[in-house]
Interface confidence: medium
C-alpha cells in the first residue's frame, strides 16, 4: 500500500508515534517519505547482505528476520515479510524499539539527512489528525 | 514439511515466451524469498534472481533483466518465472529454491529445450 | 560481482581416500559461503552453509573450512556415493554467484 501523508499521519498518531521518545509526528511521516516513499511493500538491499523492509525500511541485520541475513539479531523478533503489510502496526511496534535503543531517529539515514533539523511539522500540516 | 513442485518439461520455438511454476507447501510463502536459478551444461549454476512474493519485490540479475520476470500468487503458493524472446541460449534446467542465503529446498528443476 | 573459482576442475579418487575441494573467491565475503553436492539428473543439495556448518543428515565425513577469499571442502574417506559434482555459493552479496564446480569422479 502506498499511503497518503496525512493518511499515514493519522495511522502513525492511532499507534503511538505523535512525540514518541520526544519525536513528534512530522519526523516520523517525514522519514517514511524518504525511506519508502510512502510503500508498505518497500524493499532496498544493502551492500552488507542485509535488506530494509516496509515503511520505515527496517533492517533485516539487526531488527527482523527474513531468513538469509548472516548474523541477524532478529531485535524486534518478527518476520521481515510482516513489516511490508498494508497495517502498520508491526513497522511502528519494531520503530519504537528502534528509536528507544539509544541513538533515537538518528537509526533512520534518511530522517538523518533529510528530516533532522528541517520543519517537519510541515508535514503534517493540514491534515485532520 | 517444506517442497517446492516445479512444473513439467517445455519444448519452445524460438522467439516464443514460457512460463515456469513453482509450487510451494509446508511453509509460510510469503515469508521467504524464492530464487530462480539456471544450469546449462558446461555453464555450471547461474541466480537469476528472486521475488518475495508477499510483497512481489523483486530483483533480478543484470544479466537476466528484460529475459526473465518473476510473479507470485499467494492464493496458490506459487511463484512464476516467464522467460521472453527465447533462443538456444535458454535452453537449460531452471530451477526455483527457497532464498535463506543458502539454498537447502529446491525444485526438481524444469527442462527447457528452445528448438 | 563476485567471482568463485573452484578447483580442480576434476578429481579422480578411489574409494576411501580424502580430498579437499578448493574454491576461491575475487574479494573476501567473509564466512558467506555454501558447499552443494549434486549428482546427474538431480537437485543440488547442501552439504555446508557458512563455509562449516553442517546440514543435518550429511554425513560427518564432509567438513568445510575458510575464510576471507579462501574456502575448503574436505571429504574424509570418499564413500561411491559422494561421486558427483560439487559446487560453492556465495551469499555476500548480489547477484548471488556459484563456483564452476569440481567433478569427484572414480579413479
Known amino acids: 500500500k502506498v499511503f497518503g501523508r496525512c493518511e499515514l499521519a493519522a495511522a502513525m498518531k492511532r499507534h503511538g508515534l505523535d512525540n514518541y521518545r520526544g519525536y513528534s509526528l512530522g519526523n516520523w511521516v517525514c522519514a517514511a517519505k524518504f525511506e519508502s516513499n510512502f510503500n508498505t511493500q518497500a524493499t532496498n538491499r544493502n551492500t552488507d547482505g542485509s535488506t530494509d523492509y516496509g515503511i520505515l525500511q527496517i533492517n533485516s541485520r539487526w531488527w527482523c528476520n527474513d531468513g538469509r541475513t548472516p548474523g541477524s539479531r532478529n531485535l524486534c523478533n518478527i518476520p521481515c515479510s510482516a513489516l511490508l503489510s498494508s497495517d502498520i502496526t508491526a513497522s511502528v511496534n519494531c520503530a519504537k524499539k528502534i528509536v528507544s535503543d539509544g541513538n533515537g531517529m538518528n537509526a533512520w539515514v534518511a530522517w538523518r539527512n533529510r528530516c533532522k533539523g528541517t520543519d517537519v511539522q510541515a508535514w503534517i500540516r493540514g491534515c485532520r489528525l | 514439511q517444506v517442497q517446492l513442485q516445479e512444473s513439467g518439461a517445455e519444448v519452445m520455438k524460438p522467439g516464443a515466451s514460457v512460463k515456469i511454476s513453482c509450487k510451494a507447501t509446508g511453509y509460510t510463502f510469503t515469508t521467504y524469498w524464492i530464487e530462480w536459478v539456471k544450469q546449462r551444461p558446461g555453464h555450471g549454476l547461474e541466480w537469476i534472481g528472486e521475488?518475495?512474493?508477499?510483497?512481489?519485490?523483486?530483483y533480478y540479475n543484470e544479466k537476466f533483466k528484460g529475459k526473465a520476470t518473476f510473479t507470485a500468487d499467494t492464493s496458490s503458493n506459487t511463484a512464476y518465472m516467464q522467460l521472453s524472446s527465447l533462443t538456444s541460449e535458454d535452453s537449460a534446467v531452471y530451477y526455483c529454491?527457497?532464498?535463506?542465503?543458502?539454498?537447502?529446498?529446491w525444485g526438481q528443476g524444469t527442462t527447457l529445450t528452445v528448438s | 560481482d563476485i567471482e568463485l573459482t573452484q578447483s580442480p576442475a576434476t578429481l579422480s579418487v578411489t574409494p576411501g581416500d580424502s580430498v579437499s575441494l578448493s574454491c576461491r573467491a575475487s574479494q573476501s565475503i567473509s564466512n558467506n559461503l555454501h558447499w552443494y553436492q549434486q549428482k546427474s539428473h538431480e537437485s543440488p543439495r547442501l552439504l555446508i552453509k557458512?563455509?562449516?556448518q553442517s546440514m543435518s543428515g550429511i554425513p560427518s565425513r564432509f567438513s568445510g573450512s575458510g575464510s576471507g577469499t579462501d574456502f575448503t571442502l574436505s571429504i574424509n574417506s570418499v564413500e561411491t556415493e559422494d561421486f558427483g559434482m560439487y559446487f560453492c555459493?556465495?551469499?555476500?552479496?548480489?547477484?548471488?554467484?556459484f563456483g564452476g564446480g569440481t567433478k569427484l569422479e572414480i579413479k
Open positions: 521475488i518475495l512474493p508477499g510483497s512481489g519485490s523483486t
Open positions: 557458512y563455509t562449516s
Open positions: 529454491a527457497r532464498g535463506d542465503g543458502w539454498y537447502y529446498y
Open positions: 555459493q556465495q551469499s555476500n552479496s548480489w547477484p548471488r554467484t
